[in-house]
């Protein structure tokens, strides 16, 4: 990341910024499909791409309420192999559904410190967050 | 989203938070792969997962110093059908490689704006931001 | 003030279906950042978290009995039903339900700050 | 699922005495809440996020740790603070709320 200077009142703090909580309405983050119930492992011919996938998906909810975005999705592989694209259920050996992990910024809520100790409300401390974004049919690894 | 409330010091703006850059370093973003110059349209038996994938895909910067996170990345296909797991290369008609859509909660750093107008440094404004994550070996969709 | 207060039936036979249900007052469950849960605790044993309901209606369960419970929401009456199926013996227990979302100036908590008295559950034949 | 293992399971003290009950998560965690609970009772919040008293809660009682280990210390023990103490920690995914086995504290 390229440096954002400090961008306080004369009264803040240095390396803390103002946030403004959107001046846009944002709505709750919602994945394709929250189909927590669907656990089987095949190819649909409609519906959301996590359940048309041959390497079908469902989605885990992820909350903290002192964490921005506070709800994340984790995708959870339905099958250890690819769904055959012939029958949409017969399992594949030759293909792995493995996950695609991602490192997302996040922010968590920390309390902040004045200079003589004392609180200053809350500040935001920026993190790197690993979630799995979906599962993704890949041929196995040829090891050399 | 639940209501995070205002957070200032008392010569503070409503609606306004303090936001401390990150206490811990924080290294910046890579994918998995930033293989921009291999566009074949094939499935390797090595690399990273978007190479390996039978609906491989390349990753395109996208790069805002306004932004936080200020570097995305896009996913864009490389077949439009999926890559036969039996060859690697030939691509299989039965099935789509299709973009996986989300959207991202991102920060654009904008001017904040004092009692009287004047510039009090700039806050953060939060907004959706559409990515593609990854392509997807679906079956195709049957109309009813 | 707050007060929540747990209800239901006192005695059940196995393989029935428990419905407690948390009447609470003080506060709104659709106050953004409120959730409610439920707790148990065996005769002499430890307390145990079940199931969680938020203001938004997202709902948490413990993993190993998800497939036993339902919590549910009437915001309007001020009421979380908690639904368990099939019950045993060893389902025998002192139900609590109890608020969270308490709002510090450093975040949020997820300590549940407020509970009802519980409501004991035998199940026996 | 993060398992808490609270140590010890019983513990002796008397009035006037130093009591710390310690709480182990099976991974690291960023906090860890403390509950008190009489005979008869429900439980009643001690600590909040660590080392923050709950409201009414004296001040002999604290809060410490972090990662995997975390302490409640009651620097000078009275007739009423003997009790069973409860750890107890939120894990955002799954959404999961856990409790320790608790620690029974009684009068030698």
């Known amino acids: 990341y390229s440096h954002w200077p400090s961008c306080c009142p004369s009264k803040g703090y240095p390396s803390e910024e103002l946030l403004r909580w959107s001046t846009v309405p944002v709505p709750p983050l919602k994945p394709a499909s929250l189909d927590f119930h669907s656990v089987s492992c095949r190819a649909s011919e409609d519906g959301p791409l996590n359940s048309r996938a041959i390497s079908p998906w469902r989605y885990e909810l992820d909350r903290d309420l002192n964490r921005l975005p506070q709800d994340l999705y984790h995708a959870r592989c339905l099958c250890p192999h690819c769904v055959s694209l012939q029958t949409g259920s017969h399992m594949d050996p030759r293909g792995n559904s493995e996950l695609l992990y991602h490192n997302q910024t996040v922010f968590y809520r920390r309390p902040c410190h004045g200079k003589k100790g004392n609180h200053k409300g809350y500040c935001l401390e920026r993190r790197l967050y690993r979630v799995s974004l979906a599962c993704v049919c890949v041929r196995p690894r040829v090891m050399g | 989203y639940s209501h995070w409330p205002s957070c200032c010091p008392s010569k503070g703006y409503p609606s306004e938070e303090l936001l401390r850059w990150s206490t811990v370093p924080v290294p910046p973003l890579k994918p998995a792969s930033l293989d921009f110059h291999s566009v074949s349209c094939r499935a390797s038996e090595d690399g990273p997962l978007n190479s390996r994938a039978i609906s491989p895909w390349r990753y395109e910067l996208d790069r805002d110093l306004n932004r936080l996170p200020q570097d995305l990345y896009h996913a864009r296909c490389l077949c439009p059908h999926c890559v036969s797991l039996q060859t690697g290369s030939h691509m299989d008609p039965r099935g789509n490689s299709e973009l996986l859509y989300h959207n991202q909660t991102v920060f654009y750093r904008r001017p904040c704006h004092g009692k009287k107008g004047n510039h009090k440094g700039y806050c953060l404004e939060r907004r959706l931001y559409r990515v593609s994550l990854a392509c997807v070996c679906v079956r195709p969709r049957v109309m009813g | 003030q707050v007060t929540l207060r747990e209800s239901g039936p006192a005695l059940l036979k196995p393989t029935q279906t428990l419905t407690l249900t948390c009447t609470f007052s003080g506060f709104s469950l659709s106050t953004s950042g409120m959730g409610l849960g439920w707790i148990r605790q065996p005769p002499g044993k430890a307390l145990e978290w079940l199931a969680h309901?938020?203001?938004?209606?997202?709902?948490h369960y413990k993993p190993a009995l998800k497939s036993r419970l339902t919590i549910s929401k009437d915001t309007s009456k001020n009421q979380v039903v908690l639904t368990i199926t099939n019950v045993d013996p060893v389902d025998t227990a002192t139900y609590y339900c109890?608020?969270?979302?308490?709002?510090?100036?450093?975040?949020?908590?997820?300590?549940?700050?407020?509970w009802g008295q519980g409501t004991l559950v035998t199940v026996s034949s | 699922e993060i398992v808490l293992t609270q140590s010890p399971a019983t513990l002796s003290a008397s009035p006037g005495e130093r009591v710390t009950i310690s709480c182990s998560a099976s991974s690291s965690v960023s906090y860890m809440y403390w509950y008190q609970q009489k005979p008869g009772q429900a439980p009643r919040p001690l600590i909040y996020?660590?080392?923050n008293l709950a409201s009414g809660v004296p001040a002999r009682f604290s809060g410490s740790g972090s990662g995997t280990d975390y302490t409640l210390t009651i620097s000078s023990m009275e007739p009423e603070d003997f009790a069973t103490y409860y750890c107890q920690l939120y894990h955002s995914y799954p959404p999961t709320w856990t409790f320790g086995q608790g620690t029974k504290l009684e009068i030698k």
């Open positions: 109890a608020r969270m979302g308490q709002l510090h100036y450093y975040g949020y908590d997820y300590a549940m700050d407020y």
């Open positions: 309901i938020w203001w938004d209606d997202v709902k």
């Open positions: 996020r660590t080392s």
